[in-house]
Interface confidence: low
């Protein structure tokens, strides 16, 4: 066998180069045929009326032809024939790659609620071969489920991602990334998740600073509630009892002046938004006032009293009431 060819892979619209090489030349007629076995070139003459074929080189050892503006219909086997005795034939296969015409990402809903499972679809249109779609949530790769539809030798790939969203996902991009032999670099499209979540409630004791609550002192608690949407209502209640009459409520702040033992108990900050409700508890224990020791007449004694303050905060959450958006509690 004196005749050699190489397979060619080319991107649609670009140029394919077909080469028929002869090892031991005897000036035999060489010709190139298309997949329909029509003669493209007979030596250096082109009988085929397709001007996209151009002669790059013709010699006794090579026939080299370019095919410009390659389309998918050009795909197939091209035959080199050498009219030796006996005739020799070798073929080269042209494979045409078609990058996806369009990449679309479609998210089931613009705003999701924590714990909800949403569907995200990404469609890569009309490529050849079929596109591989990869999913990322931020930097984390996720597993999607792809369906391939073939139409006229082209493939439309739709990948479905079922995504259970958490509050940490708010503002995180969901990325659909395409891998295709005709695509160099990164072809991707993305959508940002918007996740609504019920409040997270945290109580902070802003006074006294050292955390020790004694009779006669004042107490100030601040309730911090973070959620999406931002909690519309933050309320203070006393669990299983009335709020002391001398307690002052000011927005997220609870102020109790002149503490006494009857103020002991659990104080709850409740916050809610359209997703649900949550609360945090503060257990107040009022200690005795510091004892004052009268000064001795002859001896000076310094007494240091160390008191350990127990600050207990119990946080609880519950899903939204009936009629509001329900969320799965984690």
């Amino acid at each position: 066998q004196n005749l050699f060819t190489k397979d060619v892979t080319v991107i649609e619209g670009e140029v394919a180069t077909i080469s028929c090489q002869v090892n031991k030349s005897d000036d035999s007629v060489i010709q190139l045929l298309n997949p329909n076995r029509q003669t493209i070139y007979f030596r250096d003459f082109r009988p085929l009326k397709d001007s996209r074929f151009q002669l790059l080189n013709f010699s006794s050892s090579e026939l080299k032809v370019s095919l410009t503006n390659v389309s998918i219909s050009d795909e197939g086997r091209y035959f080199c024939q050498l009219y030796t005795d006996p005739p020799q034939e070798s073929y080269t296969t042209i494979t045409v790659l078609v990058p996806p015409r369009n990449l679309m990402i479609d998210i089931q809903k613009d705003t999701a609620v924590e714990g909800e499972e949403i569907e995200v679809n990404c469609t890569a249109m009309a490529s050849k071969p079929a596109t591989t779609i990869r999913w990322f949530k931020g930097n984390t790769e996720l597993k999607g489920k792809s369906e391939v539809e073939e139409w006229s030798d082209m493939y439309t790939v739709t990948s479905q991602l079922m995504l259970k969203v958490h509050k940490e996902d708010d503002g995180v991009p969901v990325i659909c990334q395409v891998e295709h032999p005709a695509v160099t670099g990164n072809l991707q499209t993305q959508r940002y998740l918007e996740v609504q979540y019920k409040p997270q409630v945290h109580i902070q004791m802003t006074y006294p600073l050292q955390g020790l609550t004694r009779e006669g002192d004042a107490l100030e608690l601040t309730c911090e509630a973070i959620g999406k949407p931002q909690p519309v209502m933050v309320t203070w209640v006393r669990v299983d009892d009335e709020m002391p009459q001398h307690a002052v409520l000011s927005g997220p702040n609870l102020f109790i002046n002149n503490l006494n033992k009857t103020d002991n108990g659990t104080y709850r900050c409740e916050a809610s938004n359209i997703v649900g409700k949550a609360h945090s508890d503060y257990m107040l224990y009022v200690y005795d006032p510091p004892t004052t020791i009268p000064p001795p007449t002859t001896t000076t004694t310094t007494t240091t009293t160390t008191t350990t303050t127990i600050l207990t905060i119990i946080t609880d959450s519950r899903a939204g009431e009936e009629g509001s958006i329900r969320a799965v509690d984690h």
Epitope: G13, N69, V70, N102, M125, E149, T156
Partner: antibody, heavy 116, light 108 residues
């Protein structure tokens, strides 16, 4: 200035041929797919044909397939529509449009009248 | 089917809100694009994608999509908004373009 200018329209008899041109300027022509869209008098818009940026892919509406040929010359920044075997129902204002999946740039159109 | 269906005519009082709709199977997969065409003029792209306006298009124009229906909403219609409005999309292959029949908007 970014613009498209169509030419080549006119009066032609049924069965005749006509070649429309669309000259593009102000943008990198070879980077964009292009389409032809037509509008019969008093009627709506009808997509006719499209071609990829390189010219390697062409697409046609069923109503013109086999009679019309879309092509482009990127060196001349020009889009073409070769119309053969014309019929009375091909009478329309023919627009060329830049194809980004949506048509974000249109020419003013060239009128083709097919009548005996 | 790759057809897109629009109401032939819609009217709106000056300053009021109007919604023009477009229905078709392809809109289950694709967003529609919307074009405004005034008499004797070429069409102009108004909305594309989910709800994107080309620069120069007033923000009273907005787009939305649900199921197989796309909508163009004009909030506070002006006299200059009187025109024909066309939606368009692609068939399932992505290679063929389809237009709606157009909606003639009259501002009263």
């Amino acid at each position: 200035e970014v613009q498209l200018v169509e030419s080549g329209g006119g009066l032609v008899k049924p069965g005749g041929s006509l070649r429309l041109s669309c000259a593009a300027s102000g943008f990198t022509f070879s980077s964009y797919a292009m389409s032809w869209v037509r509008q019969a008098p008093g009627k709506g818009l009808e997509w006719v044909s499209a071609i990829s940026g390189s010219g390697g892919s062409t697409y046609y509406a069923d109503s013109v397939k086999g009679r019309f040929t879309i092509s482009r010359d990127n060196s001349k920044n020009t889009l073409y529509l070769q119309m053969n075997s014309l019929r009375a129902e091909d009478t329309a204002l023919y627009y060329c449009a830049r194809d980004n999946w949506y048509f974000d740039l249109w020419g003013r159109g060239t009128l083709v009248t097919v009548s005996s | 089917s790759s057809e897109l269906t629009q109401d032939p005519a819609v009217s709106v009082a000056l300053g009021q809100t109007v919604r023009i709709t477009c229905q078709g199977d392809s809109l289950r997969s694709y967003y529609a694009s919307w074009y405004q065409q005034k008499p004797g003029q070429a069409p102009v792209l108004v909305i594309y994608g989910k709800n994107n306006r080309l620069s120069g298009i007033p923000d009273r124009f907005s787009g939305s999509s649900s199921g197989n229906t796309a909508s163009l909403t004009i909030t506070g219609a002006q006299a200059e908004d009187e025109a024909d409005y066309y939606c368009n999309s692609r068939d399932s292959s992505g290679n063929h373009v389809v237009f709606g029949g157009g909606t003639k908007l009259t501002v009263l």
